[in-house]
């Protein structure tokens, strides 16, 4: 059976995925290639918005936001004026750590 993960080994915590008459590895963050044996750059997918710079840390990715943006992925504009707007904050992951 071609569509079978039983004999397929995926390295570095990757998981075998069946489908379309074939099987492949779905790799953990930071790994790639057919069997997840190659180092991959998780920042290559450009996970930060609005020109934020991506950095890979041991605990996960981090975005350093361009001036005027905030949020874990720099998704929110910072608007110091207006009641309905976001509070002013320095660039980066401010304000606060959103993890709960």
């Amino acid at each position: 059976d071609l569509d079978d993960c039983a004999g397929r080994a995926c390295a570095n915590g990757g998981t075998c995925v069946e489908g379309g008459g074939a099987h492949r590895c779905s790799c953990a963050l930071g790994f790639g290639g057919r069997d997840c044996r190659e180092r991959a750059d998780p920042c290559a997918a450009r996970p930060c918005a609005h020109g934020g710079r991506c950095y890979a840390h041991f605990s996960g990715l981090v975005c350093a936001c361009a001036p005027g943006y905030m949020g874990a992925r720099c998704e929110f504009p910072v608007h110091p004026d207006g009641a309905s707007a976001l509070p002013a904050a320095p660039p980066g992951l401010r304000p606060g750590d959103p993890q709960r």
């Epitope: 996960g60 990715l61 992925r73 993890q99």
Partner: antibody, heavy 124, light 113 residues
Framework: QEQLVESGGGLVQPGGSLKLSCKVS????????VSWVRQAPGKGLEWIGY????????YYASWVNGRFTISSHNAQNTLYLQLNSLTAADTATYFC?????????????????WGPGTLVTVSS | DVVMTQTPASVEAAVGGTVTINCQAS??????LSWYQQKPGQPPKLLIY???TLASGVPSRFKGSGSGTQFTLTISDLECADAATYYC???????????????FGGGTEVVVK
């Protein structure tokens, strides 16, 4: 092909707990997160929370109040929703949903791939 | 928390007609507004994200517009297959907890005659 499949639903007594699973495949967590959304019978959609595995972050709706916990395991291909202190008001279909967060530098924050859902019934 | 108010709760229109659904956010959500279609017994389906961008495979009869706090979904040239419940969804900055959160509108049932 992108896919999410929930499991673990069923009948549970008031005050009880349940752990739902979501098996995901076919996409890269650099750009996507996974959200849990529920829908009571005949009612609208209610967001519970989401996990952004690449950033190691978990976010919850304010009403969750610590009763529910989202986690991931096994190279981030299986996600979980732990439900505690359940009441009849928690009876719903629970959906596991892919969230397009930031793709190629563009922020989307739309829920683009939905699982079929798993029904949780809280009753004595 | 942001409250998404969807109007009307129900709307009826003839085949070939046009339906407009409104969604109002209680605070500025910028362009982070998505629309979903749900038919009985099925999970919702993404129609539009970022206010006006059509999801893959969605016909151009569906049009999203708006910004800030006021948003609209317009369905033109109505077909029987458009009979469904439609939901708006926002992504917003939650100042109380300092992170992003999602919220859904209450839904609009579209009946096609």
């Amino acid at each position: 092909q992108e896919q999410l499949v929930e499991s673990g639903g069923g009948l549970v007594q008031p005050g009880g707990s349940l752990k739902l699973s979501c098996k995901v495949s076919g996409f890269d967590f650099s750009n996507y997160g996974v959200s849990w959304v529920r829908q009571a019978p005949g009612k609208g959609l209610e967001w519970i929370g989401y996990i952004d595995p690449a950033f190691g972050r978990t976010y919850y709706a304010s009403w969750v109040n610590g009763r529910f916990t989202i986690s991931s395991h096994n190279a981030q291909n299986t996600l979980y929703l732990q439900l505690n202190s359940l009441t009849a008001a928690d009876t719903a279909t629970y959906f596991c949903v892919r969230v397009a967060l930031v793709v190629a530098g563009v922020a989307y924050y739309g829920m683009d791939v939905w699982g079929p859902g798993t029904l949780v019934t809280v009753s004595s | 928390d942001v409250v998404m108010t969807q109007t009307p709760a129900s709307v009826e229109a003839a085949v070939g007609g046009t339906v407009t659904i409104n969604c109002q956010a209680s605070q500025n959500i910028y362009s982070y507004l998505s629309w979903y279609q749900q038919k009985p017994g099925q999970p919702p389906k993404l129609l539009i994200y970022r206010t006006s961008t059509l999801a893959s495979g969605v016909p151009s009869r569906f049009k999203g517009s708006g910004s800030g706090t006021q948003f609209t979904l317009t369905i033109s040239d109505l077909e029987c297959a458009d009979a469904a419940t439609y939901y708006c969804q926002s992504y917003y900055y939650s100042s109380g907890s300092s992170y992003g959160a999602f919220a859904f509108g209450g839904g609009t049932e579209v009946v096609v005659k």
